[in-house]
Amino acid sequence: DTGAPYWTRPERMDKKLLAVPAANTVRFRCPAAGNPTPSISWLKNGREFRGEHRIGGIKLRHQQWSLVMESVVPSDRGNYTCVVENKFGSIRQTYTLDVLERSPHRPILQAGLPANQTAVLGSDVEFHCKVYSDAQPHIQWLKHVEVNGSKVGPDGTPYVTVLKTAGANTTDKELEVLSLHNVTFEDAGEYTCLAGNSIGFSHHSAWLVVLP
């Protein structure tokens, strides 16, 4: 039967307002049918929308009745309208896109990590630290130490020595684990996972107890 275009999955078109963080990928879909098979075109704020209208371009997937924009930026905000038509009629749907500028934050460390450990003399120990960060994090493992019999400097901040930090060939995954082999009584004490990015730092600490 011949006929005007109609939506084939209207339940998937309910969400007319889309708010996404900057740098995400956005896909608008207008699945339709009709006979003859209708064409689909896209408008932004009521005007024809083409790839050259945005940095990074757009992907039009006519088979899937979709418009895809990768790495969205604030200038992508607006009303996007799909126009589906054949010679018997046309239908349209408008979506509103809001691009949220993510406010950068210091790294977030998973609660409970690293965990306190008790180990037997001569055994191996692993401390784990899970880091979440928008900006590239710089991870360090610190051990709290004493200097001239004191655990803190003159200003009251704890003395630490850096045990492990990023090397040129060290992956983030490797840095999320601190391995101690053949532990001695000197290894006992407080260990800190410290993660910093361009915004600031976060740290979690755990204790190692070494038993004879």
Partner: antibody, heavy 126, light 111 residues
Framework: QVQLVQSGAEVKKPGASVKVSCKAS????????MHWVRQAPGQGLEWMGW????????NYAQKFQGRVTMTRDTSISTAYMELSSLRSEDTAVYYC???????????????????WGQGTLVTVSS | DIALTQPASVSGSPGQSITISCTGT?????????VSWYQQHPGKAPKLMIY???NRPSGVSNRFSGSKSGNTASLTISGLQAEDEADYYC??????????FGGGTKLTVLG
């Protein structure tokens, strides 16, 4: 982005003091140590010391102890370096530099300078 | 009182590779994997190029690389370009006086 903006050039007489400021923006001022490094004309870099903006604690290079004072005002994210009893050999460009030392610890083996101020020329001349 | 020893000058032609050495002792360069390198153009502030011996901050060209063997750290610049002409300083932690710099190396790009 991180910015360190220093006060303008100074001309001082021998025996006088000079106080150079360094205003930080684009990051949490109290999270990173602030260091001071100087460079005499045609010479290399010379480390003078650090201040921990979080605690106010300081550590000065042996050479400058007794003559240098480093302070900070956290309310305006500004660090200061005052050098007293100036002599002609103190003529140099003085830089503040953000140290990659987390200010809630005292590191005993680590650190580098990831951001620098534009420098302040201090001329000591009679 | 310069703690770390660098050659006063090195030179190379565009496209070549050069290496700048930084020699210390077991109480600074040799004792820790925490050497950094700075580039300084005339009249400008130093700029961090390498940290933790071999890491590059974001935005620094991968033509710059760092390494360390024993008490000597090295900065290598490959595919030399005119804009690489500058002074280069190494810096390390010293367990006697906290922070030490090398005396600096003037890199001249011939041509």
């Amino acid at each position: 982005q991180v910015q360190l903006v220093q006060s303008g050039a100074e001309v001082k007489k021998p025996g006088a003091s000079v106080k150079v400021s360094c205003k930080a923006s684009g990051y949490t001022f109290t999270s990173y140590y602030m260091h001071w490094v100087r460079q005499a004309p045609g010479q290399g870099l010379e480390w003078m010391g650090w201040i921990n903006p979080n605690s106010g604690g300081t550590n000065y290079a042996q050479k400058f102890q007794g003559r240098v004072t480093m302070t900070r005002d956290t309310s305006i994210s500004t660090a200061y370096m005052e050098l007293s009893s100036l002599r002609s050999e103190d003529t140099a460009v003085y830089y503040c530099a953000r140290g990659y030392w987390y200010a809630y610890f005292t590191y005993i083996n680590y650190g580098y300078f990831d951001n620098w101020g534009q420098g302040t020329l201090v001329t000591v001349s009679s | 009182d310069i703690a770390l020893t660098q050659p006063a000058s090195v030179s190379g032609s565009p496209g070549q590779s050069i290496t700048i050495s930084c020699t210390g002792t077991s109480s600074d360069v040799g004792g820790y994997n925490y050497v950094s390198w700075y580039q300084q153009h005339p009249g400008k502030a130093p700029k961090l190029m390498i940290y933790d011996v071999s890491n590059r901050p974001s935005g620094v060209s991968n033509r710059f690389s760092g390494s360390k063997s024993g008490n000597t750290a090295s900065l290598t610049i490959s595919g030399l370009q005119a804009e690489d002409e500058a002074d280069y300083y190494c810096q390390s932690y010293d367990n006697n006086s906290d922070v030490v710099f090398g005396g600096g190396t003037k890199l001249t790009v011939l041509g």
